[in-house]
């Protein structure tokens, strides 16, 4: 007799899970010299405690307590770029300017980028079938309940000048329902955090507005003001040219307004 | 082979200064992590320092934090350990340790023995 | 600065097999290899194991570790006289940002 399986509205866990975050660990220790003794096997024992036999839609902040405690990885707090519905070119930023950091330069981001997992309660299964999605199944499943936790650690951990990256094209450049606005935002720590700085990226070639002067940036000024943190905006009307000079920034041509 | 090859060690007053060399050869010092760790006379191994490799960070343990400081010079194949503002419980053998991508010391030196006493 | 727990003495007799514990936390042994290291009086320490479980060459596989959790253990089979030593357990701390020695265990064959 087929056993009943909750069927979810989002996609399954990323076929090979297991062996992808560890895969990845292993990967990451390479790269990162600092975490060359990290012991990748009890990363995925602790990463496979936060779900496993667990209701998908009944995840904490505390299952992930235990993985949390590998997340003391010190990456320089002034030196942090968070993102909102931007992602690969913040990514292709900090490739660049490699003394910058989003959240999937650190171990945990990484292993995590771009993956799906869910286990189901009561059993060691992995479910490759279908996921809880965030907004029509529940917002308590194991890979939102993730990242906002690793979200709010970041945040908590900057200082100094935070930068972030911002979609200029979307119809909200600021969205409160984002994981930048409704999780980051508001666990940057006033005492710590001088200044958050907002670089709003253009989508078109003729775009010459100021779309510091969005009412969606203004709301952010206004959260940011409101926490005692001075807010600062810039525009990047060429991307492609901002990339470009941060690679080389003795071009001549990166004088002027990117 | 490897070979690490410690000196600079001797008596010394409290509140003096003392610098540690360790020689190396017979691996491309340049690539590896490398580490001081000592014994105290009737006491366990305690780590002190690390250093990287590349553009070097250091790595402290908190009782020596701000008093030691650990260098390279790639060029010579040697490391050093600065040692200021010793104390009576600094007294050790001090060992010269190469560190292996894992993060274990797979070789060390013979010791060099610091004593601190007026 | 607490390091790791270590019994401070262990003994079998000859051929015997020995087994040494090693306590720690989530922030060292936890998510981090554990070394095991041999240290004869007036001699350099020796790498006797890394990555938890791993023998360089020319470690005899009497010895081998083992991990679970926030412990460790070395296990010396077919106890032989030249095993006589101080055995130290480490591991990188996160909380330290360094390694963490174990108190040491002096290994006596009977």
């Known amino acids: 007799v087929p056993r009943w399986r909750q069927q979810w509205s989002g996609p399954g866990t990323t076929k090979r899970f297991p062996e992808t975050v560890l895969a990845r660990c292993v990967k990451y220790t390479e790269i990162h010299p600092e975490m060359r003794h990290v012991d990748c096997q009890s990363v995925w024992d602790a990463f496979k405690g936060a779900f496993i036999s667990k209701h998908p839609c009944n995840i904490t902040e505390e299952d992930y307590q235990p993985l949390m405690k590998l997340g003391t990885q010190t990456v320089p707090c002034n030196k942090i770029l968070l993102w909102s519905r931007i992602k690969d070119l913040a990514h292709q930023f900090t490739q660049v300017q490699r003394d910058m950091f989003t959240l999937e330069d650190t171990l945990l981001g990484y292993l995590a980028d771009d993956l799906t997992w869910c286990g189901e309660f009561n059993t060691s299964k992995i479910n490759y079938q279908s996921c809880p999605d965030w907004r029509k199944d529940c917002s308590n499943n194991p890979v939102s309940v993730f990242w906002k936790t690793v979200s709010r650690r970041f945040a908590e951990a900057a200082c100094d000048v935070v930068h972030v990256m911002l979609n200029g094209s979307r119809s909200k450049i600021f969205d409160k329902n984002s994981t930048f606005g409704s999780v980051e935002v508001h666990n940057l720590q006033p005492e710590k955090v001088q200044t958050l700085e907002a670089w709003v990226i253009h989508g078109g070639r003729e775009d010459s507005r100021d779309l510091c002067q969005d009412p969606t940036i203004k709301e952010l000024e206004s959260i940011i003001s409101k926490r005692n943190i001075q807010f600062s905006c810039k525009n990047i009307y060429r991307p492609d040219k901002f990339l470009q000079c941060v690679k080389n920034p003795e071009d001549s041509s990166c004088t002027s307004e990117i | 082979q490897v070979q690490l090859v410690e000196s600079g060690g001797g008596l010394v007053k409290p509140g003096g200064s003392l610098r540690l060399s360790c020689a190396a050869s017979?691996?491309?010092?340049?690539?590896?992590?490398m580490s001081w760790i000592r014994q105290a006379p009737g006491k366990g191994l305690e780590w002190v320092a690390s250093?990287?490799?590349?553009?070097?960070?250091?790595y402290y343990a908190d009782s020596v934090r701000g008093r030691f400081t650990i260098s390279r010079d790639n060029a010579k194949n040697s490391l050093y350990l600065q040692m200021n503002s010793l104390r009576a419980e600094d007294t050790a053998v001090y060992y010269c340790?190469?560190?292996?991508?894992?993060?274990?010391?797979?070789?060390w030196g013979q010791g060099t023995l610091v004593t601190v006493s007026s | 600065q607490a390091g790791l727990t270590q019994p401070p003495s262990a003994s079998g007799t000859s051929g015997q097999r020995v087994t040494i514990s090693c306590s720690g936390s989530?922030?060292?042994?936890?998510?981090?290899?554990v070394y095991w290291y041999q240290h004869l009086p007036g001699t350099a320490p020796k790498l006797l194991i890394y990555k938890n479980n791993q023998r360089p060459s020319g470690v005899p596989d009497r010895f081998s570790g083992s991990k679970s959790g926030n412990s460790a253990s070395l296990a010396i089979s077919g106890l032989r006289s030249e095993d006589e030593a101080d055995y130290y357990c480490a591991a990188w701390d996160d909380s330290l940002s360094g390694y963490v020695f174990g108190s040491g265990t002096k290994v006596t064959v009977l």
């Open positions: 989530s922030s060292n042994i936890g998510f981090h290899f």
């Open positions: 017979g691996f491309t010092f340049s690539d590896d992590y």
């Open positions: 250093v990287s490799n590349g553009r070097p960070t250091t």
């Open positions: 340790a190469r560190e292996a991508w894992g993060g274990e010391f797979t070789n």
